[in-house]
């Protein structure tokens, strides 16, 4: 029950996160005009990843797309790439996780397959969230750098009678949406990975039956040779025949692929 809840919650949190990443990527307000000493502005500039906009006091808003690809800063291209990778990975993760949900029955899909898919989607969500956080952080860093550069420029060359007011840009709403969304996707991914551990079929907890032969003792372990699904503690199909009889609890456990949470 707890596993299903964790998986379901992870899915929902990731879904909200990915929706947020998509929203942030599409938003125009990645950077907004800094109203440092002029809170009342007649012309307000803001920029997104795909276009820049100007909102006039009259209410008219005009947006222009960045129609050039080569003329754009490399950093902006990198941010675009990170956000798109994040969305693509997140979308694939959502698709995989739908089939992995314990509450959804698809044919005769085994729990082992569901666990595998849950882990896959969890990792995808984690990477998706990290891509979004990285993209937003790179853009924020770019803004901070430009902000201080334009601030320095504002106080140079003011000797003449005519002042040229340099437009400075600060963090837009999309950055905060992106950070929160990336964080949610990351949390959702971690929850999916945690849920995966509970979904992985465990060994039946029997005590090993010991057969004492006259010559030497051999312990028969139930499920000694598993089908190579990659699940369960005996992932390497290693024979569990050793010199003497042991109980199940004494057997060396090998790290499964679900231990990296």
């Amino acid at each position: 029950m707890a596993v299903t809840a964790c998986q379901g919650l992870g899915f929902v949190v990731s879904l909200i996160g990915i929706a947020g990443i998509i929203a942030a990527t599409c938003m125009d307000q990645w950077s907004t005009q800094d109203l440092y000493n002029n809170p009342v502005t007649a012309v307000f500039n803001y920029q997104g990843l795909w276009r820049s906009c100007v909102r006039e006091s009259s209410g008219f808003t005009e947006c222009r797309g960045y129609f050039t690809l080569l003329g754009l800063p490399a950093m902006l291209q990198a941010v675009r790439a990170l956000m798109i990778v994040g969305i693509v990975l997140g979308a694939i993760g959502l698709l995989v996780s739908i089939f992995a949900l314990k509450c959804i029955r698809i044919g005769s899909m085994e729990d082992s397959a569901k666990a595998n898919m849950t882990l896959t989607s969890g990792i995808m969500f984690i990477v998706s969230g990290l891509c979004a956080i990285a993209g937003v952080s790179v853009f924020a860093n770019m803004l901070v750098t430009n902000f201080w550069m334009s601030t320095a420029n504002m106080y140079t060359g003011m000797g003449g009678m005519v002042q040229t007011v340099q437009t400075r840009y600060t963090f837009g709403a999309a950055l905060f949406v992106g950070w929160v969304a990336g964080g949610l996707t990351l949390i959702g991914g971690v929850m999916m990975c945690i849920a995966c551990r509970g979904l992985a079929p465990e060994e039946t907890n029997y005590k090993a039956v010991s057969y004492h032969a006259s010559g030497h003792s051999v312990a028969y372990k139930p499920g000694g040779f598993k089908a190579s699904t990659g699940f369960g503690s005996n992932t390497k199909n290693k024979k569990i025949y050793d010199g003497g009889a042991r109980t199940e609890d004494e057997v060396q456990s090998y790290p499964s692929k679900h231990d990296y949470v």
Epitope: Q33, N38, V40, T41, A42, V43, N45, Y46, Q47, S52, C53, V54, E56, S57, S58, G59, F60, E62, R64, V162, Q163, T164, V165, Q166, T167
Partner: antibody, heavy 118, light 113 residues
């Protein structure tokens, strides 16, 4: 046809109050940012106040801030300017105008005259 | 506040002559976001309210004859009437639309001989 008709002007003593109205027709009033602009006897134009389409914000120059209040009634398609603590330098023709693309005042009323004198 | 300075204060010309009037702002009116200059020109005929002629420094309002042309960028702007007509007798005002408070120039009075 766009029409803006101002009313409420007149002669008032210094320190007195007056409320101007502007009736709008021929356009979707509640979609437009509206302004009051005045023209002094020396023919100088001065922006007096701006109000957003949805009544969310108002702007005033320092010369009238705290004394003048711009408001609007979108249901009645009417713009108002409440003027108090009037001074002789407030004597002017007061025009109401709509703010269009480029923040330009694209439609003007005929104006109403306000004289502040003792 | 942005100060708008118009010159000359008055002009007397003959019909069909080309006329140029100037407007200068104390700060740049060029908006970097859309590369537009937030300067407007108005025409006020005697006994009438001002009428919008040109916005964004060079965009003619609909219905305005094409003999009116606005030009300039940053702080220096010009209104040109290519062939003055008798009905162009008016005072021409420029206005800063870039930042509050919106400010107007003192006007250029155009008179016809």
């Amino acid at each position: 046809e766009v029409m803006l008709v101002e009313s409420g002007g007149g002669l008032v003593k210094p320190g007195g109050s007056l409320k101007l109205s502007c009736a709008a027709s021929g356009f979707t009033f509640n979609n437009y940012v509206m302004c009051w602009v005045r023209q002094t006897p020396e023919k100088r134009l001065e922006w007096v106040a701006t109000i957003s389409s949805g009544n969310f914000y108002t702007y005033y120059p320092d010369s009238v801030k705290g004394r003048f209040t711009i408001s609007r009634d979108n249901a009645k398609n009417t713009l108002y300017l409440q003027m108090s603590s009037l001074r002789s330098e407030d004597t002017a023709i007061y025009y109401c105008a709509s703010l269009g693309r480029g923040n330009a005042l694209d439609n003007w009323g005929q104006g109403t005259s306000v004289t502040v004198s003792s | 506040d942005i100060v708008m300075t118009q010159s000359p204060a008055s002009l007397t010309v003959t019909a069909k002559e080309k006329v140029t009037m100037s407007c200068r702002s104390s700060q740049s009116l060029l908006n970097s976001g859309n590369q537009k200059n937030y300067l407007t020109w108005y025409q006020q005929k005697p006994g009438q309210p001002p009428k919008l002629l040109i916005y964004w420094a060079s965009t003619r309002e609909s219905g305005v004859p094409d003999r009116f042309t606005g030009s300039g960028s940053g702080t220096d702007f010009t209104l040109t009437i290519s062939s003055v007509q008798a009905e162009d007798l008016a005072v021409y005002y420029c206005q800063n639309d870039y930042s509050y408070p919106f400010t107007f120039g003192s006007g250029t009075k155009l008179e016809i001989k």
